[in-house]
Amino acid sequence: GSTVPPMVNVTRSEASEGNITVTCRASSFYPRNIILTWRQDGVSLSHDTQQWGDVLPDGNGTYQTWVATRICRGEEQRFTCYMEHSGNHSTHPVPSGNSHHHHHHHH
């Protein structure tokens, strides 16, 4: 099939005292090969500081996955979710407050 770029959605949730968990979800993409990782100050975080979900079919012939990491509250702006798919990339910052935002990466 043809390439379908991911929808990327970044959310934040309260973790332990002084920390938040930021989660980056990519959905509705094809083919299934994707890079999804958190970057701090422009550089990818090490694998052991991130948690990944499996790349799973979402029932529409496309796929979904996620990556999460725990960060200090107040440091959110230093972090960006980096997505790479089919030779294209996009970057997705952490929203302020408790809001969330959808980004659609267009190839």
């Epitope: 890079i35 970057r39 701090q40 100050d41 422009g42 550089v43 990818s44 702006q77 230093r78 972090f79 960006t80 790479e84 030779g87 294209n88 990339h89 996009s90 970057t91 910052p93 929203p95 302020s96 809001s99 935002h101 980004h103």
Partner: antibody, heavy 117, light 107 residues
């Protein structure tokens, strides 16, 4: 010291192409995205796109998607921006910049591209 | 695309004056805003990022503030070397967009 050094000024004919280079030094080239921005004479700044020098993956402004090609050579720590089908409105200074998280922290000195018949 | 409306487009001021430049985004950019100073024939120089964080080496007379859609750059006491053009830029979503610039001239 982080440095981005760009190639020299170019004069091009309408319909031709130009390739501007941006040589990085003072940091790990493949770790950071390189962004490209242009500034027409007396005008504001316009984002062209970005490249991950490590993988070659790109992100283009839709306005430039059909005419701009971003590449990078890891062996020489150099990023390139090629713009095709040049027209007079493409006369501008072209800048490369390093993406540090969520802002551009270092910029090249700029390359003036003049499109004239 | 997010539009960045910067005002004023130019201003005349004297050394020692307090100068305020504003930037309004067409949508919430979650404080992902940078301010740059540019002098003729030079590349932009980063002054402020994340709306209010001063870049390394930038004098404390510069300050940034704002959230949501409205942002301000303030120069508390204008110095001779501050006469230049100032731009804002949003980093919330691509295409990254810039304000049209504010030229600060000598009165």
């Amino acid at each position: 010291e982080v440095q981005l050094v760009q190639s020299g000024a170019e004069v091009k004919k309408p319909g031709s192409s130009v390739k501007v280079s941006c040589k990085a030094s003072g940091y790990a080239f493949t770790n950071y995205l390189i962004e490209w921005v242009r500034q027409a004479p007396g005008q504001g700044l316009e984002w062209i796109g970005a490249i991950n020098p490590g993988s070659g993956a790109t992100n283009y402004n839709e306005k430039f998607k059909d005419r701009a090609t971003l590449t990078a050579d890891k062996s020489t720590n150099t990023a390139y921006m090629e713009l095709s089908s040049l027209r007079s409105e493409d006369t501008a200074v072209y800048f490369c910049a390093r993406f540090l998280g969520n802002y551009f922290d270092n910029w090249g000195q700029g390359t003036l591209v003049t499109v004239s018949s | 695309d997010i539009q960045m409306t910067q005002s004023p487009s130019s201003l005349s001021a004297s050394v020692g004056d307090r100068v305020t430049i504003t930037c309004r985004a067409s949508g919430n950019i979650h404080s992902y805003l940078a301010w740059y100073q540019q002098k003729p024939g030079k590349s932009p120089k980063l002054l402020v990022y994340y709306a209010e964080t001063l870049a390394d080496g930038v004098p404390s007379r510069f300050s940034g503030s704002g959230s949501g859609t409205d942002y301000t750059l303030t120069i508390s006491s204008l110095q001779p070397e501050d006469f230049a053009t100032y731009f804002c830029q949003q980093f919330w979503t691509t295409p990254y967009t810039f304000g049209q610039g504010t030229k600060v001239e000598i009165k």
